[in-house]
Amino acid sequence: REAAPKSYAIRDSRQMVWVLSGNSLIAAPLSRSIKPVTLHLIACRDTEFSDKEKGNMVYLGIKGKDLCLFCAEIQGKPTLQLKEKNIMDLYVEKKAQKPFLFFHNKEGSTSVFQSVSYPGWFIATSTTSGQPIFLTKERGITNNTNFYLDSVE
């Protein structure tokens, strides 16, 4: 039987959720007037880039959209983007699609996502509402790299 992605709402410690704005992901306060994305998460079957200390390798997509999170270098800086791609198309590939891969690590009750293409760069939200979700190598005060995966199904 083919695997199915797991579905989660994603939230940070300041109760910010991920929201789709056009073809970008932004962080916005948890609110009745805001529709948070449902994150699709599925493990990569290929073990080529695996590193158990960093976590499980996963693909991340947006439920209901053919959009997946993707890392690319823009002007010399690792950048988080959304690319038109069905998460199951990535999953069925025999070879790991490195730019779409993230190490998913658990830290207590929170989840951390590190780019496989750019080790040391983590998915983050800033302290300001309405800002894009981005990649950072600075974990700490000025941004948030720890997320709660809330079951929505």
Epitope: P29, S31, S33, I34, S109, Y148, D150
Partner: antibody, heavy 122, light 111 residues
Framework: ELQLQESGPGLVKPSETLSLTCTVS??????????WGWIRQPPGKGLEWIGS???????YYEPSLKSRVTISVDTSKNQFSLKLSSVTAADTAVYYC??????????????WGQGTLVTVSS | ESVLTQPPSVSGAPGQRVTISCTGS?????????VHWYQQLPGTAPKLLIY???NRPSGVPDRFSGSKSGTSASLAITGLQAEDEADYYC???????????FGGGTKLTVL
């Protein structure tokens, strides 16, 4: 239907630790996306949030009380509890437990216990 | 001093309309966190009256309505009745405190 019931001593001596328990019925304390809070109301005054714990076990405390407060969950008894150390007369209040769901009440509290009066006095 | 500011008291005659304001800041209401309103009748626990700025839980009469704009919110009560005499509290979330915040409460007197 979810119901909450506070319990604990009504009288606590100054400098001691106030301990209260909130028993949850009609639902599981580990149910996804729920948060559980403690709110107090000094006599004749307004509501003051003390702290919360959610289904992940994450705790959040009012900054001015953080050094004295501990909130924990006992899943086997379907309860959550409040401990407030080094109490003074200023901690005399009616203590309420309350709950909400991140994706249904959006950081509001839709179910409350009836409250329990705690007096700090020697 | 409460993080959210409410008038200490308001009053109105039966049948009238009254409003209660709730003023916050850029780290709570102004940051687009929702505002919730509670009614506390004398000697009882608070009851959720409005959630998510303008939504009534089932059983709450449509005489009660909420709104929000910028860093402020308000609760309106139309067709005032004697049983509306109570304390009313607004509540939101504040990201700078990583916690829930309440207004100081407003005592509604029905004349």
């Amino acid at each position: 239907e979810l119901q909450l019931q506070e319990s604990g001593p009504g009288l606590v001596k100054p400098s001691e630790t106030l301990s209260l328990t909130c028993t949850v019925s009609g639902g599981s304390i580990t149910a996804s996306n729920y948060y559980w809070g403690w709110i107090r109301q000094p006599p004749g005054k307004g509501l003051e949030w003390i702290g919360s714990i959610d289904y992940t076990g994450s705790t959040y405390y009012e900054p001015s009380l953080k050094s004295r407060v501990t909130i924990s969950v006992d899943t086997s008894k379907n309860q959550f509890s409040l401990k407030l150390s080094s109490v003074t007369a200023a901690d005399t209040a009616v203590y309420y437990c309350a709950t909400g769901n991140y994706y249904e009440t959006y950081l509001g509290f839709d179910v409350w216990g009836q409250g329990t009066l705690v007096t700090v006095s020697s | 001093e409460s993080v959210l500011t409410q008038p200490p008291s308001v009053s109105g005659a039966p049948g009238q309309r009254v409003t209660i304001s709730c003023t916050g800041s850029s780290s709570n209401i102004g940051a687009h966190y929702d505002v919730h309103w509670y009614q506390q009748l004398p000697g009882t626990a608070p009851k959720l009256l409005i959630y998510g700025n303008d939504n009534r839980p089932s059983g709450v009469p449509d005489r009660f309505s909420g709104s929000k704009s910028g860093t402020s919110a308000s609760l309106a009560i139309t067709g005032l009745q004697a049983e509306d005499e109570a304390d009313y509290y607004c509540q939101s979330y504040d990201y700078s405190l990583s916690g829930y915040v309440f207004g100081g409460g407003t005592k509604l007197t029905v004349l």
